[in-house]
Interface confidence: low
Amino acid sequence: DTEIKVNPPQDFEIVDPGYLGYLYLQWQPPLSLDHFKECTVEYELKYRNIGSETWKTIITKNLHYKDGFDLNKGIEAKIHTLLPWQCTNGSEVQSSWAETTYWISPQGIPETKVQDMDCVYYNWQYLLCSWKPGIGVLLDTNYNLFYWYEGLDHALQCVDYIKADGQNIGCRFPYLEASDYKDFYICVNGSSENKPIRSSYFTFQLQNIVKPLPPVYLTFTRESSCEIKLKWSIPLGPIPARCFDYEIEIREDDTTLVTATVENETYTLKTTNETRQLCFVVRSKVNIYCSDDGIWSEWSDKQCWEGEDLSKKTLLR
């Protein structure tokens, strides 16, 4: 009984289309597949950033696969051919592995790359990224930001830089159509007459870096002799009400400090008739139903009631 063997895929390579970390892994069918014309050959692909402990594993019938990587590090991948048991009258047959690697040869020492990169998607509308120049780089060093997400034909350069002392230290992005819930890739590279500058790569999803506007129109209403309802309005913009969490900070007579996190635009507070002063502020954040992470808004303006019977007055009017 001759042992059934199959070759690994041919021409296995990692191709960089210039999307700042979104790479193509592609290959060709193995040689000598003639014996298995009636079979659908499958491929098991494993890949990771060099240094990562775990491989991502994909089984596919296609001759290509696409995914995002951290280009600050190298990438390694391996692939082999799988013949399912239906083709071999028994157990599955695997080829040996074909392996490949990819990395961008780094220019400049790590200290020349941008420091403290910080990106915030304000109110789910306006993306702003800022950074500090690398350690010890000269004033002739300038940084350029490029970005890409699925839907763009090619990587785009920032057209509205924030500058300090003639250097680019940030970018105000234009309207980014259909850019959330997918990886957003950024490269900040640099140029200097004196020394090569190391590029930096960043990947995130915009819905996870949203900083909403603070809530507005805070009001008080006396619900009963011992209950006061605090109300506020969601800030304007594209974020739906169901996506907000709120944190409230309440001071009573300058002594107690109550903090609470709520999902709705109201909060009922137990109080005493002796309460002479009540102040509260609210801030908002995108909740777990709409993102994996987020940034708290600034606190709202403080709203206070003081020295008047709350039962007779609804505040802010």
Epitope: V216, Y217, G237, D301
Partner: antibody, heavy 119, light 111 residues
Framework: QVQLVQSGAEVVKPGASVKLSCKAS????????MNWVKQRPGQGLEWIGR????????HYNQKFKDRAILTVDKSTSTAYMELRSLRSEDTAVYYC????????????WGQGTLVTVSS | DIQMTQSPSSLSASVGDRVTITCRAS??????????MNWFQQKPGKAPKLLIY???RQGSGDPSRFSGSGSGTDFTLTISSLQPEDFATYFC?????????FGQGTKVEIK
């Protein structure tokens, strides 16, 4: 609670100037814009302009650009409007009104100051 | 400048009536998915009071019988059940472009 208290009524002669004040309390003055609105007796409302109480940035209705000057004094949380070269059609009630941002409306108004231009 | 045209200029109604006031802008007042349209109520000798902002959002402390709708150029203020304190003049106002402009007003009188 939020309060905008405006200065008292003024009677001025044609060609003269007047400076109206609007003292804010009960909120963080520098977080808001202050708008000024004109209303002639029995007429509608006319927006004069606004000033960012934090940065001092101003936006004017071109109709008033050369004659209205908006300023703020952050230390006293007071907004001012100076109207120059007054004429009879400037006889009106002038309101200050705070605004959080373009889409949020002018949510609190002063009680108004009546300016009468008469010789 | 964006022109704002309100209709009717006045109307007579009874307590409990449903009242509708319309406002048309000479060009769209929408931007960023928001309608920059506000509605104010003014009583004689008093300052205007914000009822509705961003076309449909209620100003704080305002009764729920006031509602706003519309987008682009055509907007409506509705009072679902007119109350005695609602007899006043109502103004629409756009805040999309400087100079901000108001409608000429709609006076709601007792029938």
């Amino acid at each position: 609670q939020v309060q905008l208290v405006q200065s008292g009524a003024e009677v001025v002669k044609p060609g003269a100037s007047v400076k109206l004040s609007c003292k804010a309390s009960g909120y963080t003055f520098t977080n808001y814009w202050m708008n000024w609105v004109k209303q002639r007796p029995g007429q509608g409302l006319e927006w004069i302009g606004r000033i960012d109480a934090y940065a001092g940035e101003t936006h004017y209705n071109q109709k008033f650009k050369d004659r209205a000057i908006l300023t703020v004094d952050k230390s006293t949380s007071t907004a001012y409007m100076e109207l120059r070269s007054l004429r009879s059609e400037d006889t009106a009630v002038y309101y200050c009104a705070r605004g959080y941002g373009d889409a949020y409306g002018m949510d609190h108004w002063g009680q108004g100051t009546l300016v009468t231009v008469s010789s | 400048d964006i022109q704002m045209t309100q209709s009717p200029s006045s109307l007579s109604a009874s307590v409990g009536d449903r009242v509708t006031i319309t406002c048309r802008a000479s060009e769209s007042v929408d931007n960023y998915g928001i309608s920059f349209m506000n509605w104010f109520q003014q009583k004689p000798g008093k300052a205007p009071k914000l009822l509705i902002y961003a076309a449909s959002r209620q100003g704080s402390g305002d009764p729920s019988r006031f509602s706003g709708s519309g987008s682009g150029t055509d907007f409506t203020l509705t009072i679902s059940s007119l109350q005695p304190e609602d007899f006043a003049t109502y103004f629409c106002q756009q805040s999309k472009e400087v100079p901000w402009t108001f409608g000429q007003g709609t006076k709601v009188e007792i029938k």
